[in-house]
Structure formats: structure tokens, C-alpha cells
């Protein structure tokens, strides 16, 4: 969480951003909130990116003002117009690119003053893993697959029964480049699986951590997976 304050000469207002990550090829959100104003006419929102000459986005007098927008963001940005009046300056970024990573500044002017805060935006690829029993294998085998990751993640297996066990000797992980030549498909196979146990396939890079769980009993198979973005620090 980054909290910024205003500039001298006018009252300062508090602006708050949250470091976040974007999944390339999908839409992302750069979070920014500020002390709300009661009227829209005086609110100006400017998004800037370090090293980029033009603006990422500008909203003023109740509408987008995109004449100074940098070419790399053309047609890809939007604020939540109905929420500006209540202090939400967050930016929707369409079709996130690897090159969108960097330091952004959310700069706000209202009738009460000015303020700004920086935001670190990471980009990469992350997806939910799915763990299945591999019935084609000669022994009891689990297969963990996740379609899109970048940068290359680490994969670690764990089990509820054998807590702390190292499964690196009985697992095999491969990374297959996807057609767009950036992201990769992750496939990890775990051998010598025992029944009545819960296994977890944990995939992690510096952007996200995802876990796929599978519980195998004689009568049923239960699956669960979740994904968590790392480094969501507020400013």
C-alpha cells in the first residue's frame, strides 16, 4: 500500500495505490483511491508511467481527455466513470502486455487539493492448476497441468500424510512454450501415489502462487485449486 500526499501551495489530499500484477493477454486493474470530492467538475485524474513520454490516461471535467495519451496505451485504458465521484481513480488496462510492467503514478487534483502515489505493476502469466489421476500410467500417478505461466515457475509437490517429504525424486516437471512464444504450459507428474491421501501441486513465480489439491480415496476423488497474487503492497 502506498499512500501519497499532495504538493505545497494547495491543500494536500491522500492518494492510495496498491501494487498489483497483470496477466498478459487479459485485462488488468491498476488500483488507486483518493479523498472524494462532492462535485465532478473539479476532479482530474492523471495516470503516468515512468519512462513513457505521453500520459497513460487522463480524466477531467467528467470525461476522458486522451489527446496527450501515449500511443502504447491507445484504446486500452478506462477509468470506472461512475466511481470517480466516490474517490475511485483505478484504471482498467485492456489486453495487458509484458511491456506494461513498471512504475505508474496516480496523480489527482480535486477542489480540496492535489496528491499522488506510485504503483509497481508487474506483468506475467499465471493460471489455475488442475490435478488429475493419470490412468494411463503403469503405477498410481498424478498429473498437474496449468496452461499459462511466465516467467518460468517452480513446481513443488506436497502431501498431507507425508508432511515435509521431498517429492522431487518421484516427480517430473516440463515446460512447453505456447503458440505466442511467451507463456508456457506447465505439466508436472507425480509417481508412486498412495490412496487415502491429499496431494498438492504448488506452482509459483515472482508474480503468483497457485495450488491444486487432489484427495484420492477408494470411493471418490475431490479437487480444489486456488491462486494468489504475490506482492500486493499498498502505497
Amino acid at each position: 500500500l502506498i499512500i501519497g500526499f499532495g504538493i505545497s501551495g494547495r491543500h494536500s489530499i491522500t492518494v492510495t495505490t496498491v501494487a498489483s500484477a497483470g496477466n498478459i493477454g487479459e485485462d488488468g486493474i491498476l488500483s488507486c483511491t483518493f479523498e472524494p470530492d462532492i462535485k465532478l467538475s473539479d476532479i482530474v485524474i492523471q495516470w503516468l508511467k515512468e519512462g513513457v513520454l505521453g500520459l497513460v490516461h487522463e480524466f477531467k471535467e467528467g470525461k476522458d481527455e486522451l489527446s496527450e495519451q501515449d500511443e502504447m496505451f491507445r484504446g486500452r485504458t478506462a477509468v470506472f466513470a461512475d466511481q470517480v465521484i466516490v474517490g475511485n481513480a483505478s484504471l482498467r488496462l485492456k489486453n495487458v502486455q509484458l511491456t506494461d510492467a513498471g512504475t505508474y503514478k496516480c496523480y489527482i487534483i480535486t477542489s480540496k487539493g492535489k496528491g499522488n502515489a506510485n504503483l509497481e505493476y508487474k506483468t506475467g502469466a499465471f493460471s489455475m492448476p488442475e490435478v488429475n489421476v493419470d490412468y494411463n500410467a503403469s503405477s498410481e500417478t498424478l498429473r498437474c497441468e496449468a496452461p499459462r505461466w511466465f516467467p518460468q515457475p517452480t513446481v513443488v509437490w506436497a502431501s498431507q500424510v507425508d508432511q515435509g517429504a521431498n517429492f522431487s525424486e518421484v516427480s517430473n516437471t516440463s515446460f512447453e512454450l505456447n503458440s505466442e512464444n511467451v507463456t508456457m504450459k506447465v505439466v508436472s507428474v507425480l509417481y508412486n501415489v498412495t490412496i487415502n491421501n491429499t496431494y498438492s501441486c504448488m506452482i509459483e513465480n515472482d508474480i503468483a502462487k497457485a495450488t491444486g489439491d487432489i484427495k484420492v480415496t477408494e470411493s471418490e476423488i475431490k479437487r480444489r485449486s486456488h491462486l494468489q497474487l504475490l506482492n500486493s503492497k499498498a502505497s
Epitope: P36, K39, G62, I85
Partner: antibody, heavy 115, light 107 residues
Framework: QVQLQQPGSVLVRPGASVKLSCKAS????????MNWVKQRPGQGLEWIGG????????EYNEKFKGKATLSVDTSSSTAYMDLSSLTSEDSAVYYC????????WGQGTLVTVSA | DIVMTQSHKFLSTSVGDRVSITCKAS??????VAWYQQKPGQSPELLIS???YRYTGVPDRFTGSGSGTDFTFTISSVQAEDLAVYYC?????????FGAGTQLELK
């Protein structure tokens, strides 16, 4: 669930003053504006003013300057409006409404000015 | 002050009808217009903010459109419970101002 609680009604004498309250519950209190709106019987809505709960900074409709004074007590999550030198023209329902979109409204306080 | 003019004080309709209420601002207010519904003896309720954004939990038969000075609020298929007074309001500049209201009534 956000709720704004206001007293149902109050009877005051001409020339007197009254302090109306609006107690908020169910959400963070200080990060919003609290607006006050007047509605005379059978009439439309008039914005009196608003107060930013975090700082106590306020904005008034010029028409109500000198008539209404807005204040806030963050410890009790309550916004107040003082109405002074009351006349029959001030007899109305007074609503508090939270944030700059007027997303949540209190039930209103009926102020009757009568001798 | 910005004047918000609702051309109809009363609007007669039948259940199932499509009905539109107009509101004109005396100057450009961008999309800073909200619409509220007030039923007899009740507080107003926010339906539409920023001209066209339906507020949380508001049925999708209610829509808003417009920008600049001309705004429209539409109920695609009027239900009995929609009979109420509808107000437009601008939050572009202070003082915040409301239209005089349009009473929706049964024919």
C-alpha cells in the same frame, strides 16, 4: 448493510434552533461525504450541503448559508446539521444521504415549526 | 446554479409499457447525472449514477442515457411497484441540484 438512522420528527418554536442527527452504521464512517437534503411537503428535493467526514471540510448551497451548519462526531459515527432562526418555511423533511452519489439515504426527520 | 428541467410533472402509463423521462441541464454536466426513485412516504433511492450506470441491485428494466445537457431515464416494462416520483440530479458542480420530479401514474 449500511444504515443511516435519523429521528422521526421534531417540533420546534419559530425563532428557535434545532440540531438534527444522522448516525451511520455498517461501514467505514470517515471516508465519505454526508449530504443533507430538504424536502417540503409535496415538493421536490433541495441540496443543503455536504460534509467530508474525515476532515470536517464542508460545502454549502449558498441558499442555506447562515441557516444550516454541518458538523461531525467521528467517535459516534454521527453527522449533525444545526438549523437556526427557524420559520414556517423551514418546516420540511430533512434527509441525510451518504457519499457523493447519495447511495444511501436516512429515513428523514420531519421538522415542524409551529408556535 | 445549474438548473435541471424535467419536462413532465406527471406521466401516465400502464403496466408493461415502456416509459421514458427526460431531463435537461442548463449547461454541460458531462455524464454527472443520477436518477432517484421516491415512493410515497419513503426516502429517495439511487437507481442510476453517472448517467448510465445502474446502481447495485437495481433491476435491469431501469436504464439511463445521455451526456452533456440531455438525459433520459427509461423503464422498459413498467411494473406496479414502479409508480413513484423520479428525480434527476447533477453532481457536476455545486450547488448540487435536482429536477422538480416526474410522477409516474397509472392511466
Amino acid at each position: 448493510q449500511v444504515q443511516l438512522q435519523q429521528p422521526g420528527s421534531v417540533l420546534v418554536r419559530p425563532g428557535a434552533s434545532v440540531k438534527l442527527s444522522c448516525k451511520a452504521s455498517g461501514d467505514t464512517f470517515t471516508t465519505y461525504w454526508m449530504n443533507w437534503v430538504k424536502q417540503r411537503p409535496g415538493q421536490g428535493l433541495e441540496w443543503i450541503g455536504g460534509i467530508y467526514l474525515n476532515s470536517g471540510s464542508s460545502e454549502y448551497n449558498e441558499k442555506f448559508k447562515g441557516k444550516a451548519t454541518l458538523s461531525v462526531d467521528t467517535s459516534s459515527s454521527t453527522a449533525y446539521m444545526d438549523l437556526s432562526s427557524l420559520t414556517s418555511e423551514d418546516s420540511a423533511v430533512y434527509y441525510c444521504a451518504r457519499d457523493s452519489r447519495f447511495s444511501y439515504w436516512g429515513q428523514g426527520t420531519l421538522v415542524t415549526v409551529s408556535a | 446554479d445549474i438548473v435541471m428541467t424535467q419536462s413532465h410533472k406527471f406521466l401516465s402509463t400502464s403496466v408493461g409499457d415502456r416509459v421514458s423521462i427526460t431531463c435537461k441541464a442548463s449547461q454541460d454536466v458531462s455524464t454527472a447525472v443520477a436518477w432517484y426513485q421516491q415512493k410515497p412516504g419513503q426516502s429517495p433511492e439511487l437507481l442510476i449514477s453517472s448517467a448510465s450506470y445502474r446502481y447495485t441491485g437495481v433491476p435491469d428494466r431501469f436504464t439511463g442515457s445521455g451526456s452533456g445537457t440531455d438525459f433520459t431515464f427509461t423503464i422498459s416494462s413498467v411494473q406496479a411497484e414502479d409508480l413513484a416520483v423520479y428525480y434527476c440530479q447533477q453532481h457536476y458542480n455545486t450547488p448540487l441540484t435536482f429536477g422538480a420530479g416526474t410522477q409516474l401514474e397509472l392511466k
